[in-house]
């Protein structure tokens, strides 16, 4: 690797460093589909942005392979714990890759927020945050799932969100 | 942009990379003012530091525009749920910018930790963590607010804190 | 520092930037020792990796001094709140340094998840996340501790984990 080659690589690195991949997607009314699919997100307006990553059907799509810190927060809330709602809520970040038909768990949390409400008419709130570093290849996708998504509370994009940046 | 220009930019970038903006501020006895203002923070002692960011009256002040991962954790605690205390606690990161005198919500969580205590004399603890990537212009400020701040428990700067770094 | 020197430093920086220190360690059946020591972690299989950091007896070991965003999540769970189990769970990141015999608290959370269960036979789940920027010198170590670790629930490395990356 001669000086010229190194120079080109450095120039290239400077340019790529300017767009270190990062994204922050926010919750919206359309986030909860009720279809059993992943949560959907606002990608452009408000606090949301995509820089060096793309988006498709709820998924952050990696364009540049590397290690990424991925994170998600969801705001949970309800009134008491109605029958038919799971007492355990699972919030997770999952990877979709062309090499496997099934989603792979990356980071997952289980919580029992309903149990906080001591009466059936008590309003309760809880929040679940996940974050961690994972390796992602170009073309791989990351999605957020919440089971039971009926307990996710959306407002103004600041309480439920999903993001990533290359480390 | 000739080689000399590129060289200067690369030298500049190397120098600026050495001080990628970052900060970690810690809770102290003076953090809770009771004035309705944001939480105040220790900026120098112990684990606290500022690197490429400044601080003013509870706010991290941005000196270099860019995308920042901002985060905060607060330690909550109490004995039962005394009357007069909100059953919902709101913990948020907010932006201040001169053009908009009202703070802008960036990342927010609501929790109902009191509900965990099954008797009025039961001691309870809970923790709220927020983190996400936002764009900040030079001169803009980020603050942390907790409502009701009377439930924030401070001890030695490790349980309640506030930080940021450029991504 | 002449051009040649700057060039060497830039080449060096480019190479080191390629391996910006990062790690993500995952929970495994062997994580909980019951010995009073820190949690142990998987470092290679599955989602776990080490890049520019090393590992020893539960600790991430720093090889390059700098500011690091360190994080950990633990999945907690149980059935009711059996006598003998602490009603408060402490989850923390601690630093070991040759200069001090005792571990130094870096980031800590206290939670009372048991209180969510309204009956003694109720299954409950909770999750604790910590993350923040700290300065670490070469040779210093970071560990995770949970008290009472009997409430930590391990499964497939996605629910309890520990990581870091240089900022």
């Amino acid at each position: 690797d001669g000086p010229a080659g190194s120079w080109e690589q450095l120039i290239q690195e400077r340019r790529s460093h300017e767009v270190n991949p990062a994204a922050h997607l926010t919750g919206a009314n359309s986030s909860l589909t009720g279809s059993g699919g992943p949560l959907l997100w606002e990608t452009q307006l408000g606090l949301a942005f995509l820089r060096g990553l793309s988006y498709h059907d709820g998924a952050l799509v990696v364009t540049k392979a590397g290690y990424y810190y991925i994170y998600s927060k969801v705001q949970l809330g309800g009134v008491g714990c109605p029958l038919g709602l799971a007492s355990t809520i699972t919030h997770g970040l999952y990877k979709r890759t062309p090499r496997y038909p099934e989603e792979l768990e990356l980071l997952v949390s289980q919580q029992s927020p309903c149990g906080r409400a001591t009466s059936s008419s008590r309003v309760w709130w809880d929040s679940s945050f996940l974050g961690g570093v994972v390796h992602l290849e170009a073309g791989e996708k990351v999605v957020v799932r919440v089971l039971d998504e009926r307990l996710v509370r959306l407002r103004d994009g600041t309480r439920s969100y999903f993001g990533a940046f290359m480390v | 942009d000739g080689p000399a220009g590129s060289w200067e930019q690369l030298i500049q970038e190397r120098r600026s990379h050495e001080v990628n903006p970052a900060a970690h501020l810690t809770g102290a006895n003076s953090s809770l003012t009771g004035s309705g203002g944001p939480l105040l923070w220790e900026t120098q002692l112990g684990l606290a530091f500022l690197r490429g960011l400044s601080y003013h009256d509870g706010a991290l002040v941005v000196t270099k525009a860019g995308y920042y991962y901002i985060y905060s954790k607060v330690q909550l605690g109490g004995v039962g749920c005394p009357l007069g205390l909100a059953s919902t606690i709101t913990h948020g990161l907010y932006k201040r910018t001169p053009r908009y005198p009202e703070e802008l919500e960036l990342l927010v969580s609501q929790q109902s930790p009191c509900g965990r205590a099954t008797s009025s004399s039961r001691v309870w603890w809970d923790s709220s963590f927020l983190g996400g990537v936002v764009h900040l212009e030079a001169g803009e400020k980020v603050v942390v607010r907790v409502l009701d701040e009377r439930l924030v428990r401070l001890r030695d700067g490790t349980r309640s804190y506030f930080g940021a770094f450029m991504v | 520092d002449g051009p040649a020197g700057s060039w060497e430093q830039l080449i060096q920086e480019r190479r080191s930037h390629e391996v910006n220190p990062a790690a993500h360690l995952t929970g495994a059946n062997s994580s909980l020792t019951g010995s009073g020591g820190p949690l142990l972690w998987e470092t290679q299989l599955g989602l776990a990796f080490l890049r520019g950091l090393s590992y020893h007896d539960g600790a991430l070991v720093v090889t390059k001094a700098g500011y690091y965003y360190i994080y950990s999540k633990v999945q907690l769970g149980g059935v009711g709140c059996p006598l003998g189990l602490a009603s408060t769970i402490t989850h923390g990141l601690y630093k070991r340094t040759p200069r001090y015999p005792e571990e130094l608290e870096l980031l800590v959370s206290q939670q009372s998840p048991c209180g969510r269960a309204t009956s003694s036979s109720r299954v409950w789940w909770d999750s604790s996340f910590l993350g923040g920027v700290v300065h670490l010198e070469a040779g210093e170590k970071v560990v995770v501790r949970v008290l009472d670790e009997r409430l930590v629930r391990l499964r497939d490395g996605t629910r309890s984990y520990f990581g870091a990356f240089m900022v």
Epitope: N29, S30, L50 | R99 | -
Partner: antibody, heavy 117, light 110 residues
Framework: QVQLVQSGAEVKKPGASVKVSCRAS????????MHWVRQAPGQRLEWMGW????????KYSQKFQGRVTITRDTSASTAYMELSGLRSEDTAVYYC??????????WGQGTLVTVSS | QSALTQPASVSGSPGQSITISCTGT?????????VSWYQQHPGKAPKLMIY???KRPSGVSNRFSGSKSGNTASLTISGLQAEDEADYYC??????????FGGGTKLTVL
Amino acid sequence: QVQLVQSGAEVKKPGASVKVSCRASGYTFTSYLMHWVRQAPGQRLEWMGWINVGNGNTKYSQKFQGRVTITRDTSASTAYMELSGLRSEDTAVYYCARNYYNWFDPWGQGTLVTVSS
Amino acid sequence: QSALTQPASVSGSPGQSITISCTGTSSDVGGYNYVSWYQQHPGKAPKLMIYDVSKRPSGVSNRFSGSKSGNTASLTISGLQAEDEADYYCFSYAGSSTVVFGGGTKLTVL
């Protein structure tokens, strides 16, 4: 301070195209969306579309889909709106406006485009 | 996306208060606290008056206030002055990266 300065008035013939520019200053150009809004004489404001200046993504109002193209030159901190197949009803003042969170602020001063044979 | 519904015109005498309504759906006005209001004098560019339903940018008189109930947002101007005579437009985020304007209201100060 934050400012948007648009190009001058244009007179075009039916069927022609017009390209209006909007130069930004006082903020990080690539970190915000830029919208284009038009207003025909005596009519309401009409949203045309936006461009994500950072990555070039665009979204257009269905009404203008296929006729409008929004681009940007990041090195010049300038956004452009090109409208083709001009008709007399396209006579309007065209505004650029920065998207700040979920509102428009500031706005350009406006560019009058007159379509006349 | 159809326009938000505003009255075509409202009027009031100096010193009075007037309210301009802006009705949408649960997908836009009702779904988010992201309603803003713009004032436009003849031949001038629109000016932001209210954002996030009820917040005022610096430099805007506190005679201007905003509120929302259900799918309807409102702009209230108290202590009406001659210089308030202008067109007023509401605007809302509508999800999925889309936005929508109101039809505009002409305010006449009698």
